[in-house]
Interface confidence: low
């Protein structure tokens, strides 16, 4: 679980979307709960389907798979998982908050031609070498980027990841997710990990009973959750006494 400590809130949110885990905003008080959910998802996935040892098919760190035991934290979701995120029937208006896109998942996709990278899909024989010292803060965006979001995007939808069909067969594949489309003249739109499923996905409130122990003790929070509750309780009691004495005064004006 400590592997997720280096992830920014933005990156954690992206993982939640990728794994199709219903979530609200990632903040200090909810972070540990989400880390736990992601950990459980990845653990379960590895248990159900052992990692494929085949080489990756792209120019991305993300696709550098490895057969080493210490590398399995860095595998992509299987193609079956990725297909969930690309369901054509998905029409929810769940808003993509980060990574420089402002589209909703229900928008049509571009059928434009793929460019340079798509034409030369490669595999990396040195994936193991890359993976053996990788930690989880090697990610594309730090949390500061969340503040810069609503700008024009810079990467294109029409890249090596436009179609999932040119990857290995489902049985032994790892595939990356679709890039989202954003129509700009610069052929550029930063990729957004869509995590939609075949059924509609809506935001759900985080229920206290689902929290991991100590989930309330967020990194950003200066006053712990129990402290806030205590303060609130004191505040309520003070208000009650004020109300009580005011009522008493009204009853006996002399």
């Amino acid at each position: 679980m400590d592997n997720y400590a280096d992830l920014s809130d933005t990156e954690l949110t992206t993982l939640l979307r990728r794994y199709n885990i219903p979530h609200g905003p990632v903040v200090g008080s909810t972070r540990r709960l989400y880390e736990k959910k992601i950990f459980e998802y990845e653990t379960q996935r590895r248990r159900l389907s052992p990692p494929s040892s085949s080489a990756a098919s792209s120019y991305s760190f993300s696709d550098l798979n490895s057969t080493r035991g210490d590398a399995d934290m860095y595998d992509l979701p299987k193609k079956e998982d990725a297909l969930l995120y690309q369901s054509k029937g998905y029409n929810d208006d769940y808003y993509e908050e980060s990574y420089f896109t402002t589209r909703t998942y229900g928008e049509p996709e571009s059928a434009g031609p793929s460019r340079a990278v798509r034409q030369s899909v490669t595999s990396f024989p040195d994936a193991d070498a890359f993976h053996h010292q990788v930690h989880d803060d090697d990610l594309l965006s730090s949390s500061e980027e969340e503040c810069k979001d609503r700008e024009r995007p810079m990467y294109g939808r029409d890249s090596a990841y436009q179609s999932i069909t040119h990857y290995r067969p489902v049985s032994a594949s790892r595939s990356s997710l679709d890039l989202s489309y954003y129509p700009t003249s610069s052929s550029t739109s930063f990729m957004s990990s869509s995590s939609s499923s075949s059924s509609w996905l809506t935001r759900r409130a985080i229920r206290p009973e689902n929290r991991a122990p100590g989930a309330g003790l967020g990194q950003d929070r200066q006053v712990p959750l129990w402290g806030q509750l205590l303060l609130f309780l004191v505040f309520v009691i003070v208000l009650f006494f004020i109300y009580h004495f005011m009522q008493a005064e009204e009853g006996n004006p002399f």
């Epitope: 992206t14 991305s60 803060d137 594309l140 990467y155 990841y161």
Partner: nanobody
Framework: DVQLVESGGGLVQAGGSLRLSCATS????????MAWFRQAPGKEREFVAG????????YYTDSVKGRFNITRDNAKNTVYLQMNSLKPEDTAVYYC???????????????WGQGTQVTVST
């Protein structure tokens, strides 16, 4: 529009050194992992070295470990590849690009830069 511009390549004798630079314009890339790739004639483009967004983690392909060093200067929006003890097999066109791991697969520019030619003579 974001552009990647690689520079610093050239002709060098085996055992020599070069320092490649990758400058970006159009948007700060300080929040993104970056990587160097290379493509030798008749071969596929391959990963050489990577650095995470904070600069705290670096990754290398086996063949360059101990010889190459990737660094970044986020203030200058530039990524560097210091190449020492160069070998003839390091001859290739070197490209830089955005790279990342499991959270955001495939996050790199559609159009690669021109690259910079590195030629190592015997």
């Amino acid at each position: 529009d974001v552009q990647l511009v690689e520079s610093g390549g050239g002709l060098v004798q085996a055992g020599g050194s070069l320092r490649l630079s990758c400058a970006t314009s159009g948007r700060s890339l300080s929040s993104y992992a970056m990587a160097w790739f290379r493509q030798a004639p008749g071969k596929e483009r391959e990963f050489v070295a990577g650095i995470n967004f904070s600069g705290r983690r670096t990754y290398y392909t086996d063949s360059v470990k101990g010889r190459f060093n990737i660094t970044r200067d986020n203030a200058k929006n530039t990524v560097y590849l210091q190449m020492n003890s160069l070998k003839p097999e390091d001859t290739a066109v070197y490209y830089c690009n955005v790279g990342g791991r499991k959270v955001l697969a495939g996050t790199f520019f559609n159009d690669w830069g021109q690259g910079t030619q590195v030629t190592v003579s015997t």
